[in-house]
């Protein structure tokens, strides 16, 4: 049994935080090629540490098992008496098979009429279920498939002649919205330039898109 | 020693109940099924019920099922006899009996000494 | 139900005399019979079960035998102290029924 407080259960203690170098080391630091981090745990304490894990997972499943099978036991004794013969012979073992038989059979007319209820209250909730679908039917609306479709040729399906007027509004203000637009775009332009220009960027930038 | 003393006997009236005590000792009382067997002024013995050793399971003849009803305490080491719906014929000197059993034959191998019952108008 | 008869319900005998008590079922019972003996004061015991098996603490005097529906109980050499009614019980079926009984008397 592994216990919870032995060594190979135990996390390994959390690496110190590094310590700040300065600015200067960094350079070497980066172009040097450092070694592989060397593992801390051997390839032998790995497999230990790999076994007992197992073995705690073992453990897990076997207790679980145990349970169920505890919970089985514990949900029979509730339900079948033990037998309790001593001191009874043929005579009370004859009419005791009798009782049992007697309360077999009521028990299985009790299940009877369960079963009866239940299978009732399923073709009752299939009934339903069918009307339900039957009444979804009179009102089935068409399954809607995604379609790219532009806010005009939108606006014309859903108004029809009356959207002509809208669209020609929609579409001046497209229009001014557009010019200004390509103001604003030719001014930021030209200050780029020259910012380019004075920073000797131009040359560079042109070599760079060709 | 093997011993039961039965208690709670007396004379009542047709249609009435009592309730019967046998106090058992000298022996593991819930290891044993155990009876009552009721005498008539007849002298007749008439076997009136058996509960087995945990209580579980009781037998009745026809002539008392659905009246008398067999209990026991097994903490108490007491066995009961409740008694309803008493008729003249049930007037008897009732026993408290041990069970116990050979190759499937059963027994009465222990008796009390038993309590008088007279249901008279 | 199973009846039980005795073929005589008293019987005389005197002391040191060998008596032996009968009993009938109504069908085989397969030895699942006892007898019990109750004295005056209206103590019951068990002497004999399963036919032939003699209860501890009584006398090997009594004797028991018998197969299907004979059976019978025998007493040999009679004592003051065997002086009682004598009951066979069937144990092979509910209800368990008793005979009538046997008083057994002094001559």
């Known amino acids: 049994m592994a216990d919870g407080s032995s060594d190979a259960a135990r996390e390994p203690r959390p690496a110190p935080a590094p310590i700040r170098r300065r600015s200067s080391n960094y350079r070497a630091y980066a172009t040097e090629p450092h070694a592989k981090k060397k593992s801390k745990i051997s390839a032998s304490r790995k497999l230990q540490l790999k076994t007992l894990l197992l073995q705690i997972a073992k453990q897990e499943l076997e207790r679980e098992a145990e349970e169920r099978r505890g919970e089985k036991g514990r949900a029979l004794s509730t339900r079948c008496q033990p037998l309790e013969l001593a001191g009874l012979g043929f005579a009370e073992l004859q009419d005791l098979c009798r009782q049992l038989h007697a309360r077999v059979d009521k028990v299985d007319e009790e299940r009877y009429d369960i079963e009866a209820k239940v299978t009732k209250n399923i073709t009752e909730i299939a009934d339903l279920t069918q009307k339900i679908f039957d009444l979804r039917g009179k009102f089935k609306r068409p399954t809607l498939r995604r379609v790219r479709i532009s806010a005009d040729a939108m606006m014309q399906a859903l108004l029809g002649a009356r959207a002509k007027e809208s669209l020609d509004l929609r579409a001046h203000l497209k229009q001014v919205k557009k010019e200004d637009t390509e103001k604003e775009n030719r001014e930021v332009g030209d200050w780029r330039k020259n910012i380019d220009a004075l920073s000797g960027m131009e040359g560079r930038k042109k070599k760079f898109e060709s | 020693e093997v011993q039961m003393v039965e208690s709670g006997g007396g004379l009542l009236k047709p249609g009435g109940s009592l309730k019967l005590s046998c106090a058992a000792s000298?022996?593991?009382?819930?290891?044993?099924?155990m009876s009552w067997v009721r005498q008539t002024p007849e002298k007749r013995l008439e076997w009136v019920a058996t509960?087995?050793?945990?209580?579980?399971?009781?037998f009745y003849p026809d002539s008392v099922k659905g009246r008398f009803t067999i209990s026991r305490d097994n903490a108490k080491n007491t066995l009961y006899l409740q008694m309803l719906s008493l008729r003249s014929e049930d007037t008897a000197m009732y026993y408290c009996a041990r069970r116990d059993n050979y190759y499937g034959s059963s027994f009465m191998d222990y008796w009390g000494q038993g309590s008088s019952v007279t249901v008279s108008s | 139900d199973i009846q039980m008869t005795q073929t005589s319900s008293s019987l005389s005998a005197s002391l040191g005399d060998r008596v032996t008590i009968s009993c009938r079922a109504s069908?085989?019972?397969?030895?699942?019979l006892n007898w019990y003996q109750q004295k005056p004061d209206g103590t019951i015991k068990l002497l004999i079960y399963y036919t032939s098996r003699i209860h501890s603490g009584v006398s090997s005097r009594f004797s028991g035998s018998g197969s299907g529906t004979d059976y019978s109980l025998t007493i040999s050499n009679l004592e003051q102290e065997d002086i009682a009614t004598y009951f066979c019980q069937q144990g092979h079926t509910i209800p368990l029924t008793f005979d009538t009984g046997t008083k057994l008397e002094l001559k």
């Open positions: 509960i087995s050793s945990g209580g579980s399971y009781s």
């Open positions: 069908q085989d019972i397969t030895n699942y």
């Open positions: 000298g022996f593991t009382y819930s290891n044993y099924a």
